[in-house]
Amino acid sequence: VLEVYYTSLRCRCVQESSVFIPRRFIDRIQILPRGNGCPRKEIIVWKKNKSIVCVDPQAEWIQRMMEVLRKRSSSTLPVPVFKRKIP
């Protein structure tokens, strides 16, 4: 599940990791674009082992994964993509 949120909250991530997470371990991904109280883009990953991690948006593996998910979401493949706009 890929989610893009636009929020007015401050930054959520207090530390970021570049460590690769295999897709089979990922339950959900949330993207928080920069702005509205946080000067940087944030990517939050929920893992299937009930842990949660902020991923460095510059990490190559997450950029590749985002691109794959975007492509799938614009095709007919059944990969749910949620884009929620929160005022």
């Epitope: 530390q15 990791s17 009930k50 842990s51 949660i52």
Partner: antibody, heavy 122, light 107 residues
Framework: QVTLKESGPGILQPSQTLSLTCTFS??????????VGWIRQPSGKGLEWLAN???????YYNPSLQNRLTISKDTSNNQAFLKITNVDTADTATYYC??????????????WGQGVRVTVSS | DIQMTQSPSSMSASLGDRVTITCQAS??????LIWFQQKPGKSPRPMIY???NLANGVPSRFSGSRSGSDYSLTISSLESEDMADYHC?????????FGSGTKLEIK
């Protein structure tokens, strides 16, 4: 406002099964990311994590007690449960339930119940 | 399992003193550490999360730091209301493990 409250038998005998209930409000265990954990504290000693249960019924146990622990939930009644079989005097402690929410920043056990004192005595 | 070695087990300090409590992790926990305060007869409450971040409503005299595998809670100027037990918790991996606790008393 998040609140949790534990209930249990108070006193029980060795070899019996301890059944604890955590009744909570202000959140739902059907919401993505929500969990409830159990922690105990013998009088005058430190805290020991026992088990967690999550919104999707995923369960985690302390391996030192795993074969004696069962955690479960009743989502519709906002309750979580812990059973400990074959109790011994070493299980005498105050038992707490606490909420965890998988959000960033992640602070496990951000809200706690008041605790329930359990004594195992013959 | 990750072991959390907390020291001291108890200490006595005077009002205004600088107080430091330490937990040492047996494996890398990458800042996945919380400090809880537990006042007598009460439930624990989180004070510091992710090793260095102050929880809501916690006075600024409290701070957290890390040096390698050692994680510390410091009270810059002790006040009477700080008399309590303090516990560290690692949540890097299951099973979650607590330190043995530190009882902080006022001289």
């Amino acid at each position: 406002q998040v609140t949790l409250k534990e209930s249990g038998p108070g006193i029980l005998q060795p070899s019996q099964t301890l059944s604890l209930t955590c009744t909570f409000s202000g959140f739902s265990l059907s919401t993505y990311g929500m969990g409830v954990g159990w922690i105990r504290q013998p009088s005058g000693k430190g805290l020991e994590w026992l088990a967690n249960i999550w919104w999707d019924d995923d369960k985690y146990y302390n391996p030192s007690l795993q074969n004696r622990l069962t955690i479960s939930k009743d989502t519709s009644n906002n309750q979580a449960f812990l059973k400990i079989t074959n109790v011994d005097t070493a299980d005498t402690a105050t038992y707490y339930c606490a909420r965890s929410e998988l959000i960033m920043p992640y602070v496990p056990f951000d809200y706690w119940g008041q605790g329930v004192r359990v004594t195992v005595s013959s | 399992d990750i072991q959390m070695t907390q020291s001291p087990s108890s200490m006595s300090a005077s009002l205004g003193d600088r107080v430091t409590i330490t937990c040492q992790a047996s494996q890398d926990i990458d800042n996945h550490l919380i400090w809880f305060q537990q006042k007598p007869g009460k439930s624990p409450r989180p004070m510091i999360y992710y090793a260095t971040n102050l929880a809501n409503g916690v006075p600024s005299r409290f701070s957290g730091s890390r040096s390698g595998s050692d994680y510390s809670l410091t009270i810059s100027s002790l006040e009477s209301e700080d008399m309590a037990d303090y516990h560290c918790l690692q949540f890097k991996q299951y099973p979650f493990t607590f330190g043995s606790g530190t009882k902080l008393e006022i001289k």
